[in-house]
Interface confidence: medium
C-alpha cells in the first residue's frame, strides 16, 4: 500500500562541529533531518535569504571564512504541503575555534548539535 504523503512532523537542524563554532579554513556540515514520507525537497536559508543551491538535505561549507558567518536554517517543501522551516543555527568563525557556543547560538528547541 502506498503511503500517503504527509507534512513533516518535525525538522531538526544538526551542525558539525558542535556549537557551530569553527576556525577559519575549517568545514561546517549542516544536516536537515526530517520525518516525512516521501522525503521533501530541502532548501537552505542564510540570514533570511534562500541560498542559490540545488535542493539537498546536507549543506557543506568547506574552507569557511567570516563571510560564511550567519544564521542558517533549512526549509522542507512538499508539493501538497506548505514549507516547514527548522529552528535557526548560528555559525561563527573564530581564530582559535576553541570557544564555547555563543549564548542563543541555536534555536529555542535546543537543536543544532549532533547527538
Amino acid at each position: 500500500r502506498v503511503r500517503e504523503p504527509g507534512p513533516p512532523e518535525g525538522i531538526q537542524l544538526l551542525v558539525e562541529p558542535e556549537g557551530g563554532i569553527v576556525a577559519p579554513g575549517g568545514t561546517v556540515t549542516l544536516t536537515c533531518a526530517i520525518s516525512a514520507q516521501p522525503p521533501p525537497q530541502v532548501h537552505w536559508i542564510k540570514d533570511g535569504a534562500p541560498l542559490p543551491l540545488a535542493p539537498s538535505p546536507v549543506l557543506l561549507l568547506p574552507e569557511v571564512g567570516h563571510e560564511d558567518e550567519g544564521t542558517y536554517s533549512c526549509v522542507a517543501t512538499h508539493p501538497s504541503h506548505g514549507p516547514q522551516e527548522s529552528p535557526p543555527v548560528s555559525i561563527r568563525v573564530t581564530e582559535t575555534g576553541d570557544e564555547g557556543p555563543a549564548e542563543g547560538s541555536v534555536g529555542e528547541s535546543g537543536l543544532g548539535t549532533l547527538a
Partner: nanobody, 116 residues
Framework: EVQLVESGGGLVQPGGSLRLSCAAS????????MGWYRQAPGKQLELVAL???????NYADFVRGRFTISRDTTKKTLYLQMNSLEPEDTAVYYC??????????WGQGTQVTVSS
C-alpha cells in the same frame, strides 16, 4: 498555534495586477518581521520581499518597482501588491514569519499564474 493563511492568488494576464494577503493568528504579529517567498515549478525557493518589524521594506531585484509589501498590524495581515506581472512571476507564493518564539512559520501557499 501559529497559522499563516494566504489568499489572493489566481490567473492573470501579463501586465495585470494581483494583491496577495496573508492573515496571521497566534503570534505577536506587530513584532515579527514578515516576508513573501515564491517557488516556481522545478525552480528554487526564492525571496520576493521582506518587511521589518519597523515597517522597512526590502525587495528582490526582479520585483523591485513592480511589487509592494505592506502590513496591517490591526488586522494581523501581510500584503503583496503585484503590478506589471510577467509570465516569469508564475509560482506558488508563500508568506513567512521570519522569527517567532525561536521558530519560523510558513503558510500553505497561493498559486499565481501569469498567462495570456
Amino acid at each position: 498555534e501559529v497559522q499563516l493563511v494566504e489568499s489572493g492568488g489566481g490567473l492573470v494576464q501579463p501586465g495585470g495586477s494581483l494583491r496577495l494577503s496573508c492573515a496571521a493568528s497566534g503570534t505577536i504579529f506587530s513584532l515579527n518581521p514578515m516576508g513573501w517567498y515564491r517557488q516556481a515549478p522545478g525552480k528554487q525557493l526564492e525571496l520576493v520581499a521582506l518587511i521589518s518589524d519597523s515597517g522597512t521594506a526590502n525587495y528582490a531585484d526582479f520585483v523591485r518597482g513592480r511589487f509592494t509589501i505592506s502590513r496591517d498590524t490591526t488586522k494581523k495581515t501581510l500584503y503583496l501588491q503585484m503590478n506589471s506581472l510577467e509570465p516569469e512571476d508564475t509560482a506558488v507564493y508563500y508568506c513567512r514569519s521570519t522569527f517567532a518564539a525561536g521558530n519560523f512559520y510558513w503558510g500553505q501557499g497561493t498559486q499565481v499564474t501569469v498567462s495570456s
